[in-house]
Amino acid sequence: IPVIEPSVPELVVKPGATVTLRCVGNGSVEWDGPPSPHWTLYSDGSSSILSTNNATFQNTGTYRCTEPGDPLGGSAAIHLYVKDPARPWNVLAQEVVVFEDQDALLPCLLTDPVLEAGVSLVRVRGRPLMRHTNYSFSPWHGFTIHRAKFIQSQDYQCSALMGGRKVMSISIRLKVQKVIPGPPALTLVPAELVRIRGEAAQIVCSASSVDVNFDVFLQHNNTKLAIPQQSDFHNNRYQKVLTLNLDQVDFQHAGNYSCVASNVQGKHSTSMFFRVVESAYLNLSSEQNLIQEVTVGEGLNLKVMVEAYPGLQGFNWTYLGPFSDHQPEPKLANATTKDTYRHTFTLSLPRLKPSEAGRYSFLARNPGGWRALTFELTLRYPPEVSVIWTFINGSGTLLCAASGYPQPNVTWLQCSGHTDRCDEAQVLQVWDDPYPEVLSQEPFHKVTVQSLLTVETLEHNQTYECRAHNSVGSGSWAFIPISAGAHTHPPDEFLFTP
């Protein structure tokens, strides 16, 4: 650590005195203090001499000697008072800038330590300090306003009592800056805009910040717009608003609009798109397939996306048949607005019944006209099977009828013994019928197919089973010949309740 001679913490001299401050260190040393012309400096290796042969009140201050090469950064300091009876203050600054809640040091250095008891801080023109101004004084450094507030941005003077009268320093302007957390907050409304050519439009760009020093502008396709700015202050924030009013929009007004605000912390921007159209429009679409298949008893939500300008004047869901004249319950229809010009309409169909298959249409209207989007809903059913014994063209024939949706496939099994259902161990023969005869196939209904198995002689200790399956499930019917005739068995487990 460097050493200063004289080795005293402070030195008091009269104006005109000779002052010599010598600093010695291990390596090269340098002096630091308030810049002043009233010194001469002589450096010689590891020592440096700061001297004046005509000290003035302006030499009052703290002088620090440091050793730049010292990794520990040690320093020594001495405070010099030049006590000028006419000049109680040496003011080191015209202005002090701090952030809110920082301590603000107003550097009025007292030139005579004896005057410390009679010092005070005032605002210029003798005005008292604002209430709640908490300050302290150090003869070496000046007045400190603790946790300075924005409202304390004022011009201050330091006052000392000399021979019964107050002597003021030159003034110091304190600027307390608000702590700016980031770039200004922005709003640009609307977020999206559509207008028909010739209509009026308004776009509002506004920015706010705790500090008044920020800029805001609105640009259209990268061209800055010259718009008068409205300024306001409320909720402890400064607000700047730019309003673009267009009486009759045309296609050249369309495009991207950006609201941009900047301050010392950086820049924020937000954008919106303005569409100008020739006439009203109404577009219906769905992300779903318009042809829907759902298993009976399950639920389905039908969703339609609507894009429209101007807004909708009416809309509804309609059931177009074919089963009944019932209409969807209003409580099952739901509308959500994604944004100003886009909406989603949902029809919920829970636990679908056979009579609810068919066409569902969403209709919407605006000044551009009517539009409709129709869904076709087909219900899927597992197969239902029945077998009868009959003679066709004199031949004994087992006739299997299966109905379900999608169209069932049919397989015949012959197995030993009497059983409700053939299992693998019992199976004697298997016949697949790749092309059963379609008896009925109407839209939104089950498909009924018929398969024939010609049997020359019925084996009495055997079972004939017709199995049908589709993507939903399977059904079967066992036929057991008995001496007195034929006996048929639907499987016990088969129970269908939609």
Partner: antibody, heavy 117, light 110 residues
């Protein structure tokens, strides 16, 4: 070794505000006085003002109404703002450390700021 | 217009002695010490002389300064080609509470 580096936009439009930052490295910004000096092309040097780490500032009276300085000790930086600029403010702007006798012992390399529309 | 006055140019041949003058007023050079800076082309100024005649470490003793009344001068002896630069005088100005500068002298080594 103390080093100073100026940064900021090289082009400013008339009537706007010129903003520059000086970053100090190789030493602490604390306990020293830091100045801004400018030099118009082919002309002499002009002292703009100085700032101390406590926020104490002295400005050149000829520029005082348009100048603002600030210091950020946590970033080892100090800043200059010059408002309502005109073409006459086009210059190389230097930041420098001001020694106890009022001379400048460490300088930044300078940054050219042009005021033009 | 600079506060301190310097000749715009000066020249000399290698090995020669060249002097650059700087004049001011009682509020600057008359009552305060003078500093000289050297600015090589395309670089920042560099401290050359302070307190009228003191050289920082690393500055050759070919450079010397003096002051008399409200004027000061910089002398360069044994002129070398690397001395070709702009030279600025500066002094504290009491009315400014800060430094003022001369307009600079362009030294050409012929």
């Amino acid at each position: 070794q103390v080093q100073l580096q100026e940064s900021g936009p090289g082009l400013v439009k008339p009537s706007e505000t010129l903003s520059l930052t000086c970053t100090v490295s190789g030493g602490s910004i604390s306990s020293y006085y830091w100045s801004w000096i400018r030099q118009p092309a082919g002309k002499g040097l002009e002292w703009i003002g100085r700032i101390y780490t406590s926020g104490s500032i002295k400005y050149n009276p000829s520029l005082k109404s348009r100048v603002a300085m600030s210091v950020d000790t946590s970033k080892n930086q100090f800043s200059l703002k010059l408002s309502s600029v005109t073409a006459a403010d086009t210059a190389v702007y230097y930041c420098a450390r001001e020694g106890i006798l009022g001379y400048f012992d460490y300088w930044g390399q300078g940054t050219l700021v042009t005021v033009s529309s | 217009q600079s506060v301190l006055t310097q000749p715009p140019s000066a020249s000399g041949t290698p090995g020669q002695r060249v002097t650059i003058s700087c004049s001011g007023s009682s509020s600057n050079i008359g009552s305060n010490t003078v500093t000289w800076y050297q600015q090589l082309p395309g670089t920042a100024p560099k401290l050359l002389i302070y307190s009228n005649n003191q050289r920082p470490s690393g500055v050759p003793d070919r450079f010397s300064g003096s002051k008399s009344g409200t004027s000061a001068s910089l002398a360069i002896s044994g002129l070398q080609s690397e001395d070709e630069a702009d030279y600025y005088c500066a002094a504290w100005d009491d009315s400014l509470s800060g430094p003022v500068f001369g307009g600079g002298t362009k030294l050409t080594v012929l």
